[in-house]
């Protein structure tokens, strides 16, 4: 589903001819200097380049742009807006560019935008008009189908005074621009929790990545609206236990895959209702995998076969029987 | 090769049953939805049934009770179970993978004839 | 029951010729956009060319484009070429809470004149 370069027969322009043809106007579907282009697979390629700018005479055929492994810092609004537009361009990839910076309006007049991947580039300043282009209420509706922001994180050091998780919900909801989105992917990204009104507002999803983070819970999260989610990744966070609110909501979904391994599960008391779901639920792929991280003496047993008897919780004692 | 490939077509009596096959290569079938589409001869294409991901099923409103979609995702195999076939269901059956983002047919296999007739 | 209505049935058309298609619902397509058209030859199983209404598939030649919201779409060929006589199908995805539904039109037959 995602376009891919099956290009052959790539033509380059020789860097050392840019700075003889850059007094004059571009020619029309010439390839940008440190690029490599093919107009049968209406692909242009700017990868590991160094480049600090978005070239400015991309051949206005493009329906795949790549301008990975560059020196970007800065997407400023209007960074891909041409004159004719590029009315082609459906799938850009920006990853491992070195982008901080991504301004309001920085995807505007690209019409045809399906697939944006930001991914691996530490993201401190992600403006919240980034998608919608306006900071009107509700903006024009956003192309995007797939969006993929993994490992977009910045350096603790060089994160604003604010929490990176709303950042990145702002952008996601400004406008209700993202209404069509189908591909979400947000792996990697440190989040401690998920926003409560994100995902209500992204009612298309069919993939959502929340892999190797350090969700806690989602106790706060509801999956209601999200008819259409068909896999939820959720491996390698800090999940302790799925409460029946999330387990009844899951079930719900009539499509829904869920991938849960890799998180520190709590077998005690509160982890009886789950221990059950499991034990019923077609929902969840790889779940004879999931195992008890804690209390100790119920480490690396496999949920699956755990019992109510086996789920216990210490009694908790009276402030005046406790020891320090 | 990414592929998939129709079989079980053959001749039937009319009120008789037949399994069709579709066998897929170079991808997991329990990725994606798959669907079956026919067409008579010289007439136009015409959907049948779907299943999803995690197995809900959903059918035209003619096929609904008499047509069966289902898979096998250790053999990597669809199938379609066809109950009290009728002379009008005489068609080339196709097998078709749906987008895993978008809800189109991505990818055909070849069709298998089935040929209800006395 | 979901229509979907092409026109025209059939055609004409030289070699370098503007040809458009147009295919109603009688729905709106899911998220107004999921609307997919196909060519197909004899003997051949279709091809998808256009999917999300306007999204040129893998290897499709871009002389082929698609336009729509809802219920009207488009698809143009914008100078045809020898390869392009075939029949040419739109087909529509609709949802509902009783789930989903796909349909094709009833295709339109591209003949050289």
């Known amino acids: 589903s995602s376009p891919t370069s099956s290009a052959s027969s790539f033509s380059s322009s020789a860097p050392f001819l840019a700075s003889a043809v850059s007094a004059q106007p571009p020619l029309p579907d010439q390839c940008p200097a440190l690029c490599e282009c093919s107009e049968a697979a209406r692909t242009v390629k700017c990868v590991n380049r160094n480049l600090t700018e978005v070239p400015t005479d991309l051949p206005a055929y493009v329906r795949n742009l790549f301008l990975t492994g560059n020196q970007l810092a800065v997407l400023p609004a209007g960074a891909f807006a041409r004159r004719p537009p590029l009315a082609e361009l459906a799938a850009l990839n920006l990853s491992g560019s070195r982008l901080d910076e991504v301004r309001a309006g920085a995807f505007e007049h690209l019409p045809s935008l399906r697939q944006l991947d930001l991914s691996h580039n530490p993201l401190a300043d992600l403006s919240p008009f980034a998608f919608s282009g306006s900071n009107a209420s509700v903006s024009a509706p956003s192309p995007l189908v797939e969006l993929i922001l993994n490992h977009i994180v910045p350096p603790e050091d060089e994160r604003q005074n604010r929490s990176f998780e709303g950042m990145v919900v702002a952008a996601l909801l400004a406008g209700r621009a993202l209404q069509g989105l189908r591909r979400l992917e947000l792996a990697s990204n440190h989040f401690l929790y998920l926003p409560r009104d994100v995902l209500a507002q992204l009612p298309s999803l069919r993939h959502l990545d929340l892999s190797n983070n350090s969700l806690v819970s989602l106790t706060y999260v509801s999956f209601r609206n999200l008819t259409h989610l068909e896999s939820l990744h959720l491996e390698d966070n800090a999940l302790k236990v799925l409460h029946n609110g999330t387990l009844a909501e899951l079930q719900g979904l009539p499509h829904i895959r869920v991938f849960l391994d890799n998180n520190p599960w709590v077998c005690d008391c509160h982890m009886a209702d789950m221990v059950t779901w499991l034990k019923e639920t077609e929902v969840v792929q790889g779940k004879d995998r999931l195992t008890c991280a804690y209390p100790e003496k119920m480490r690396n047993r496999v949920l699956l076969e755990l019992n109510s008897a086996d789920l216990d919780c210490d009694p908790i004692l009276p402030p005046s029987l406790q020891t320090s | 090769e990414v592929q998939l490939l129709e079989s079980g077509g053959s001749l039937v009596l009319p009120g008789g049953s037949l399994r069709l096959s579709c066998a897929a290569s170079?991808?997991?079938?329990?990725?994606?939805?798959m669907s079956w589409v026919r067409q008579a001869c010289g007439k136009g294409l015409e959907w049948v049934s779907i299943i999803a991901g995690r197995g809900s099923t959903y059918y035209a409103s003619w096929a609904k009770g008499r047509f069966t979609i289902s898979r096998d995702n250790s053999k990597n195999t669809l199938y379609m179970q066809m109950n009290s076939l009728r002379a009008e269901d005489t068609a080339l059956y196709f097998c078709?993978?749906?987008?895993?983002?978008?809800?189109?047919?991505?990818?055909w296999g070849q069709g298998t004839l089935v040929t209800v007739s006395s | 029951e979901i229509v979907l209505t092409q026109s025209p049935s059939s055609l004409s058309a030289s070699v370098g010729d503007r040809v458009t298609i147009t295919c109603q619902s009688s729905q709106s397509v899911y998220s107004n956009n999921e609307l997919s058209w196909y060519q197909q030859k004899p003997g051949k199983a279709p091809k998808l060319l256009i999917y999300y209404a306007s999204t040129l598939a893998s290897g499709v030649p871009s002389r082929f484009s698609g336009s729509g919201s809802g219920t009207d779409f488009t698809l143009t060929i914008s100078s045809l070429q020898p390869e392009d006589f075939a029949t040419y199908y739109c087909?529509?995805?609709?949802?509902?809470?009783?789930?989903?539904?796909?349909?094709f039109g009833q295709g339109t037959k591209l003949e050289i004149k």
């Open positions: 087909q529509g995805s609709y949802y509902s809470g009783s789930g989903w539904y796909y349909a």
């Open positions: 170079g991808f997991s079938l329990s990725s994606y939805w």
């Open positions: 078709a993978r749906v987008s895993s983002i978008y809800y189109t047919f991505n990818l």
